[in-house]
Amino acid sequence: RAPRCRELPAQKWWHTGALYRIGDLQAFQGHGAGNLAGLKGRLDYLSSLKVKGLVLGPIHKNQKDDVAQTDLLQIDPNFGSKEDFDSLLQSAKKKSIRVILDLTPNYRGENSWFSTQVDTVATKVKDALEFWLQAGVDGFQVRDIENLKDASSFLAEWQNITKGFSEDRLLIAGTNSSDLQQILSLLESNKDLLLTSSYLSDSGSTGEHTKSLVTQYLNATGNRWCSWSLSQARLLTSFLPAQLLRLYQLMLFTLPGTPVFSYGDEIGLDAAALPGQPMEAPVMLWDESSFPDIPGAVSANMTVKGQSEDPGSLLSLFRRLSDQRSKERSLLHGDFHAFSAGPGLFSYIRHWDQNERFLVVLNFGDVGLSAGLQASDLPASASLPAKADLLLSTQPGREEGSPLELERLKLEPHEGLLLRFPYAA
């Protein structure tokens, strides 16, 4: 008799793929544009990335450091009208893209939560949650919560409002903290909260450190749903050298949880390469004309247009990983087991019941390494086969679909491999 199938877990929409942050509408659209109507025209691009949610804004009225002139119910006219927003919501819904609204109050000011009048601000947030839920948004984000006094209790209250409206609504909190204990204390009091932090930005870009951070986090959070990013708002290039971007994309898309990216992460957008552009929100490079300030500063391979035409580009890799992440059971909600593969390597298996299984091997090192996969570290339910098919490599040149002998696996410097193999009874 065939073994009984394992019962599928309840999956919310944010469990099924990546979230895409557009914190600065104007930088995202460029060319002096930057409003909600223009963003609507970019939804097809977001669809092509296979992302499940758009984290938008803040876009509310906020006069720098002025509580009285901060209105979380009003859209800043520079970004458009409530009608533009409703239209964006409708279009996004048609394309199965959820919209999460950032309500960080004083986003133009020094302290995101104002230094005084905490209760006034908290009341404003509460009212805003109810207002925007009625308007049809799918969730909210609040950032810099380390600046919010009694953050845990406020988050619990806001979570109740959000979930009270519908279990299908999401609350994301962001913190600059990278301290695991602080992160855990925020998570403890808020069951379904999705938390973005700087936890992984401390990885020092080494395999053994990254492995220990990831496994510590997963062990500490138990079976609760995680999110994975390197910060609450910034680009991957703020933390990583270019040669590690592909590796981190592969890792973020294949860890158990929701990957969260900022606009531009998919093309390796780097403020440092664009003189005069702000680090936190450089202009999005749609094509070579997106940054006219310095002629020749932008080459085709830095842009969406150029990378879309190149199957070996970072953008093409992002799209492939996003697609896999959203359709494979083992990547959607599979179990995770990390195991030893040798110095500098981080390797793990994702598996769900009798579905196709995935092996990820990441070489964080600046040297080619032979992987000594220690299958003895794995439970019987997650054993390794002798061979696995190469689904993709972060480096060009490997023959995809070909079976690789796991005993003889050798990785190039900074190479990551995603391999697949069938369930064997």
Partner: antibody, heavy 120, light 113 residues
């Protein structure tokens, strides 16, 4: 400043084992890998392997897989190379070298070397 | 394994002369991911341990005199000493740091006339 201290010499009998030490100072021991290199008199350099002090994972050159064992003691910031079943072929100078793996992957600091003589 | 071949095995030069030595690898050391060549040069003076001079084929280690110049790409590399000094008497080894096992060339012995 970065220093890797190794004892000057070891005299050992054929068939015996020897454990060489390399004490690191002047940097964060767990942030860099430790590499070991063999040099026979008047000869070139041969890479033995390296170890990551943060989690003690080691990788060996195939040639030294059955000969060498790399370990670390984080509390004393010391790396060790154990050589077993010694023969005259193992008489050489053994260097430890800091392996700057994340940034540029080369051996940027070397110990003074321990001269191992295998003789009855 | 990547085989490293150095030439000449020895050379004798006078102070002030320009010295070039060659190193060839059995496969390319160019990493397409970052366009860097993973080749290092080490100097070993008599009775001393080796010292890193150059990595990534042409990046001089801090504190190394600028008369030492590394060049080359793919499989062919050169170390040049533009104006040799008496203290440059040493063995010079190239090493690939592209892939394990890390491998060294047999060395070039530089003697001063």
């Amino acid at each position: 400043q970065v220093q890797l201290q190794q004892p000057g010499a070891e005299l050992v009998r054929p068939g015996a084992s020897v454990k060489l030490s390399c004490k690191a100072s002047g940097y964060t021991f767990t942030s860099y890998w430790m590499s070991w290199v063999k040099q026979r008199p008047g000869q070139g350099l041969e890479w033995i392997g390296f170890i990551t002090p943060s989690d003690s994972e080691a990788l060996y050159s195939q040639m030294f897989k059955d000969k060498a064992t790399l370990t670390v003691d984080k509390s004393s910031s010391t790396a060790h190379l154990q050589l077993s079943s010694l023969t005259s072929e193992d008489s050489a100078v053994y260097y430890c070298a800091r392996w700057s793996y994340g940034n540029f992957a080369a051996m940027d600091y070397w110990g003074q070397g321990t001269s191992v003589t295998v003789s009855s | 394994d990547i085989v490293m071949t150095q030439s000449p095995s020895s050379l004798a030069m006078s102070v002030g002369q320009k010295v070039t030595m060659s190193c060839k690898s059995s496969q390319s050391l160019l990493n397409s991911n970052n366009q860097k060549n993973y080749l290092a040069w080490y100097q070993q003076k008599p009775g001393q341990s080796p010292k890193l001079l150059v990595y990534f084929s042409s990046t001089r280690e801090s504190g190394v005199p600028d008369r030492f110049i590394g060049s080359g790409s793919g499989t062919d590399f050169t170390l040049t000493i533009t104006s040799v000094q008496a203290e440059d008497l040493a063995d010079y080894f190239c090493q690939q740091h592209y892939s394990t096992p890390l491998t060294f060339g047999a060395g070039t012995k530089l003697e001063i006339k």
